[in-house]
C-alpha cells in the first residue's frame, strides 16, 4: 500500500502560448484538477478506467478572466492531490492530469464545467524515490508539476510489496499493522534463499523464501490460480499458505474528498461525501443534471448526484465528455491510398484511379467481382485486370462484337470466313495449319507440327 | 432522403416478446445519428424507448430498461427493438426515428407501425 | 426523470388569432457548457407521425412557417402560433432531450 502524491506548481500561458486571456469576458471562475493513473506504460484506451486511483483536488481561488489583459499563471488550489494505492506500486505507470476551470457566474442551472487541458505522461516510478518533476504543455497552455510514490508502513521497497517489522516490534501492536510515525525504522532485509524472486517473494529469516498473494512455488515463481485466502492482503505463511495480517484496507483513509472507509471481509468500503463517487470517492459529482457532453454528445446515467455518467460522443469527437476532436484520419480508413478528408460531419475519401467505394476498398482492375461478357475470362496481371474474350467479341468487357477476320489473321495470304464458331481460314497453296502458318514442303510432308490425319493441304482450317 | 420503415408482427400474446425492425434507406446507420424507439398508445402521448448509435452504444427509458434490448443489423441497414413480457398496456404505435446529435431533436419518422398486445 | 407538464391539454382559437402552449419542466434544460436549452416542440396531425417545428427552445426547423415561434428558458417554455391557420389543427408536443428524452402529454389545437 502506498501513496502516489502530486503537486501543481503552475498553469499558465506556456511559451509563445496565449499571451492574452484566450477567453471573453466572463464572470468569476476557478480551477481545479483531477488526476488520474492508469497502470502500464502501453497506449490504453482513452475510456479505461483509473485502475491505479483517481483524485480531485479542492478549488483554487476565485479569479476573474480579463479578456483584454495578459493572461498570468491561474491561481491554484491549496495542497497535494493523493491518491492511495493498495496494492504493489506498479512501477511504470500513465499519468492524465485533467485542468478544469469552474465558472462561477448567474448561469442557470448552476455553475459550468469545461476541461482546458489535458496532459498523459507514461513513466517509470520507483516508490520511496525523490520528487520528480515535469512540465507538459497542451495546446497554448503550460502545466508544472511535480509527483512522487511513497509506500505507507509497513509496506517497503520500491513497489511497497516487502513488509518491514520495526526494531521495537513489541511496541507496535498484533502482528504486522503499521507502527507510530517514530518507530518506522525497519530492519535490513534478511539475505533470502538463492534463486528467491525479487518481485514475488520476500523473507523474513535468512535462506527462507515467502510468496506475496497470487504466488506459490519454492521460489515464489509460479503463479497461483485460486486461493483459499483470497481477499487478505499481506505475507503468505509457510505452512498454510495462508497469509498472516498485514496492513488494514482502511489504514491510511483510502477513501477520497473527505469519504468514510469502513472495512469489509478483504476489502473496504467508502461511503463518499454528495457529490462523489467511485470506489475511493476519487470522482467528482458531475451527473447528467450538469449537462457535462461537450459537441452534442448524449448523456447517460443517473441523473442525480450520486451517479455515474458518460457521454455517448457524435461522430468526431471523444473522451470522457466529448471534448476531444477526433482526428479520423489519422486511423486511415482510405483504403488503396485513398485520399482521407474529415468533413466535421462525416469522413470522406478521395479514391485513386482505378479505386471506388466509400472506403476505396472496391478495386476495379481486380478481377474479383468482375464479369467479363460473352465468355470472356478475366485476367489479373500487374495491378491491372483484362479480359481475354471470346472469338467474336472484343473490347474492355468484351461486349463488343468484333469482325474476327478484321485483324488478318491468316498467314501467307489465305483467306478469313467468319463462322459461328470462331474464323476458319482457306490456305494459299504450299501452307497450312490453323492460320496457314506452316509451309508445306515440296515432297508434300510439311513441317512441324504434322497436319492432323485427313486434313489435305489446301483445305479450309478451322481456327477453335 | 433518409426513408426509415417499421416492420414486424401486428399481433403480439401477451407475456411475449414484441419483435420490430426498422430498415433505414439513404444513410448508413453506422454514419451518424441516434437510432431511435418512439410509441404512441392509442389516443395517448409520445414515449420515447430508447436509442442505438451510430457506433452501437445503447441507452434506454429506465421505467422499460429491464425489457428492452435494441441492436442492429449494419450489413441490411437495419436496427431492431425487442421487448419482452408484453401486456397490454404495451399495444401502441411504434416509431423509428433518427436524432441529431448536434440538436438533440427527433429528425425524421418512420410512418409507425401498430402492434396489438392481446391474447 | 424529468418530467414534462403542457397546458392547456386542448385549446379552441378562432382562424388569424394568436395560439399560445406553455410547457414546464421538473428541472433546468438550460446547459451552461453549450448555452442551449435543450427542448423542442414537434406538430403531430392525425394518422401521422410528429414533426419537428422547434429545437433548442427558440430555433426554428428549415421549412417551419415563421408564424411558429418558441421561447423560453430554463424551466418554462413556450410555443406560439401567431395567426392559427387551418393547416395547424394538430397535437403539439414538447419535449425535453437535456437528460435521456421525455415528452409533454400533448395539447390539441381546434378551430375556434
Known amino acids: 500500500a502506498g501513496v502516489f502524491e502530486l503537486q501543481i506548481h503552475s498553469f499558465g500561458p506556456g511559451p509563445g502560448g496565449a499571451p492574452r486571456s484566450p477567453y471573453s469576458a466572463r464572470g468569476p471562475c476557478r480551477l481545479f484538477f483531477r488526476v488520474c493513473l492508469k497502470p502500464g506504460l502501453s497506449e490504453e484506451a482513452a475510456e479505461s478506467p483509473c485502475a491505479l486511483g483517481a483524485a480531485l483536488s479542492a478549488r483554487g481561488p476565485v479569479y476573474t478572466e480579463q479578456p483584454e489583459a495578459p493572461a498570468p499563471d491561474l491561481p491554484l488550489p491549496n495542497g497535494l492531490l493523493q491518491v492511495p494505492f493498495r496494492d504493489a506500486w506498479p512501477g511504470t505507470f500513465s499519468l492524465i492530469i485533467e485542468t478544469w476551470r469552474e465558472e462561477l457566474g448567474d448561469q442557470i442551472g448552476g455553475p459550468a464545467w469545461s476541461l482546458l487541458a489535458r496532459v498523459t505522461r507514461r513513466r517509470r516510478l520507483a516508490a520511496g524515490g525523490p520528487w520528480a518533476g515535469d512540465i507538459q504543455r497542451a495546446g497554448a497552455w503550460e502545466l508544472r508539476f511535480s509527483y512522487r510514490a511513497r509506500c505507507e508502513l509497513p509496506a517497503v521497497g520500491t513497489a511497497c510489496t516487502r513488509l518491514c517489522r520495526p526494531r521495537s516490534a513489541s511496541r507496535c501492536g498484533p502482528g504486522l499493522r503499521p507502527c507510530a510515525p517514530l518507530e518506522d525504522e525497519c530492519e535490513a532485509p534478511p539475505v533470502c534463499r538463492a534463486g528467491c524472486s525479487l518481485e514475488h517473494g520476500f523473507c523474513e529469516q535468512p535462506g527462507e523464501c515467502r510468496c506475496l498473494e497470487g504466488w506459490t512455488g519454492p521460489l515464489c515463481m509460479v503463479p497461483v490460480s485460486t486461493s483459499s485466502c483470497l481477499g487478505l492482503r499481506g505475507p503468505s505463511s509457510t505452512t498454510t499458505g495462508c497469509l498472516v495480517p498485514g496492513p488494514g484496507p482502511c489504514d491510511g483513509n483510502p477513501c477520497a474528498n473527505g469519504g468514510s472507509c469502513s472495512e469489509t471481509p478483504g476489502s473496504f468500503e467508502c461511503t463518499c461525501p454528495r457529490g462523489f463517487y467511485g470506489l475511493r470517492c476519487e470522482v467528482s459529482g458531475v451527473t447528467c443534471a450538469d449537462g457535462p457532453c461537450f459537441n452534442g454528445g448524449l448523456c447517460v446515467g443517473g441523473a442525480d448526484p450520486d451517479s455515474a455518467y458518460i457521454c455517448h460522443c457524435p461522430p468526431g469527437f471523444q473522451g470522457s465528455n466529448c471534448e476531444k476532436r477526433v482526428d479520423r484520419c489519422s486511423l486511415q480508413p482510405c483504403r488503396n491510398g485513398g485520399l482521407c478528408l474529415d468533413l466535421g460531419h462525416a469522413l470522406r475519401c478521395r479514391c485513386r484511379a482505378g479505386f471506388a467505394g466509400p472506403r476505396c476498398e472496391h478495386d476495379l482492375n481486380d478481377c474479383a467481382g468482375r464479369a467479363c461478357a460473352n465468355g470472356g475470362t478475366c485476367v489479373e496481371g500487374g495491378g491491372a485486370h483484362r479480359c481475354s474474350c471470346a472469338l467474336g467479341f472484343g473490347g474492355r468487357d468484351c461486349r463488343e462484337r468484333a469482325d474476327p477476320c478484321a485483324a488478318r489473321p491468316c498467314a501467307h495470304g489465305g483467306r478469313c470466313y467468319a463462322h459461328f464458331s470462331g474464323l476458319v481460314c482457306a490456305c494459299a497453296p504450299g501452307y497450312m495449319g490453323a492460320r496457314c502458318e506452316f509451309p508445306v514442303h515440296p515432297d508434300g510432308v510439311s513441317a512441324l507440327p504434322a497436319a492432323p490425319p485427313g486434313l489435305r493441304p489446301g483445305d479450309p482450317q478451322r481456327y477453335p | 432522403q433518409v426513408q426509415l420503415q417499421e416492420s414486424g408482427p401486428g399481433l403480439v400474446k401477451p407475456s411475449e416478446t414484441l419483435s420490430l425492425t426498422c430498415t433505414v434507406s439513404g444513410y448508413s446507420i453506422t454514419s451518424d445519428f441516434y437510432w431511435n424507439w418512439i410509441r404512441q398508445p392509442p389516443g395517448k402521448g409520445l414515449e420515447w424507448i430508447g436509442y442505438i448509435t451510430y457506433d452501437g452504444s445503447t441507452n434506454y427509458n429506465p421505467s422499460l430498461k429491464s425489457r428492452v434490448t435494441i441492436s442492429r443489423d449494419t450489413s441490411k441497414n437495419q436496427f431492431s427493438l425487442k421487448l419482452s413480457s408484453v401486456t397490454a398496456a404495451d399495444t401502441a404505435v411504434y416509431y423509428c426515428?433518427?436524432?441529431?446529435?448536434?440538436?438533440?431533436?427527433?429528425?425524421?419518422w418512420g410512418q409507425g407501425t401498430l402492434v396489438t398486445v392481446s391474447s | 426523470d424529468i418530467v414534462m407538464t403542457q397546458s392547456p391539454d386542448s385549446l379552441a382559437v378562432s382562424l388569424g388569432e394568436r395560439a399560445t402552449i406553455n410547457c414546464r419542466s421538473s428541472?433546468?434544460?438550460?446547459?451552461?457548457?453549450?448555452?442551449?436549452?435543450?427542448l423542442a416542440w414537434y406538430q403531430q396531425k392525425p394518422g401521422q407521425p410528429p414533426k419537428v417545428l422547434i429545437y433548442?427552445?427558440?430555433t426554428r426547423e428549415s421549412g417551419v412557417p415563421d408564424r411558429f415561434s418558441g421561447s423560453g428558458s430554463g424551466t418554462d417554455f413556450t410555443l406560439t402560433i401567431s395567426s392559427l391557420q387551418a393547416e395547424d389543427v394538430a397535437v403539439y408536443y414538447c419535449e425535453q432531450s437535456f437528460y435521456l428524452f421525455t415528452f409533454g402529454q400533448g395539447t390539441k389545437v381546434e378551430i375556434k
Open positions: 428541472q433546468s434544460l438550460f446547459n451552461s457548457r453549450t448555452r442551449k436549452n435543450y
Open positions: 433548442w427552445a427558440s
Open positions: 426515428v433518427y436524432g441529431d446529435f448536434n440538436r438533440h431533436a427527433m429528425d425524421y
